[in-house]
């Protein structure tokens, strides 16, 4: 569910939302760290209705959710916490 990608692309998110999305409607969360042409961290959420939204990394709900997912991933080894995609 939680993925970190390192890409050579510039920023992917034109607009960010802080609107709450419950975990039950989230399919996948992709984290794009700062760097490689983008000066900010980006969080992309794939929803279960196939739509995609960029979420403000400062939104409290996404920070809480990522912490829960990290804990959950680390307690269910051998599933990796992060998937790395090397360009």
């Amino acid at each position: 569910v939680l993925e970190v990608y390192y890409t050579s692309l510039r920023c992917r998110c034109v607009q960010e939302s802080s609107v709450f999305i419950p975990r039950r409607f989230i399919d996948r969360i992709q984290i794009l760290p700062r760097g490689n042409g983008c000066p900010r961290k980006e969080i992309i959420v794939w929803k279960k209705n196939k739509s995609i939204v960029c979420v403000d990394p400062q939104a409290e709900w996404i920070q809480r959710m990522m912490e829960v997912l990290r804990k959950r991933s680390s307690s269910t080894l051998p599933v990796p916490v992060f998937k790395r995609k090397i360009p």
């Epitope: 609107v19 709450f20 999305i21 419950p22 975990r23 039950r24 409607f25 929803k47 279960k48 209705n49 739509s51 409290e60 709900w61 809480r64 829960v68 959950r72 269910t76």
Partner: antibody, heavy 123, light 106 residues
Amino acid sequence: EVQLVESGGGLVQPGGSLRLSCAASGFTFSSYAMSWVRQAPGKGLEWVATISEGGSDAYYPDNVKGRFTISRDNAKNSLYLQMNSLRAEDTAVYYCARDYYGSGYEESPMDYWGQGTLVTVSS
Amino acid sequence: DIQMTQSPSSLSASVGDRVTITCKASQDINKYIAWYQQKPGKAPKLLIYYTSTLQPGVPSRFSGSGSGTDFTFTISSLQPEDIATYYCLQYDNLYTFGGGTKLEIK
């Protein structure tokens, strides 16, 4: 006091269409997601659809996807369910329910429910 | 899709008895389970959410426990007004209800 009142149920032939409505009061309607849940006669509960507080996102289980459409009018405090290509197995009492608080961080499920409206699909 | 297996499907108990209903999820749902009470001809009423959080106004004789895939709903001392059908609901991944437990008085 939170109140949800469904209407629009009735008898419809297989293949037909019906539009259900739910009038909400007693809370800030535009701050909450809303859902429809159904219950076939003598059977259990089954989730049908959910719409986000602003109406931009809708979610459905596979068995109604493409046939049912959930929508809302926040100015009228109203929720709707458009049901097309109805089948005998869609016969049920349809409940509207208040869902998660859109401005919150905590995840809670459907908390308040209406009394339901009966939809009968039969020839 | 997540399946919720609720048991028993029906049970008979006496006033004052401790009553336990279980729900088993087909995969880990963390603590995202709720319990509803439905009386004949009425709408479901939320009793408990997030496994053990009591909805305001719900008597303290109702409680919930569990995590992961196994969950329990308990009525510590059955009252006549508790006669109803009880449903669990997982809301970790979309929504799935359990099949229900019809509770009757002996």
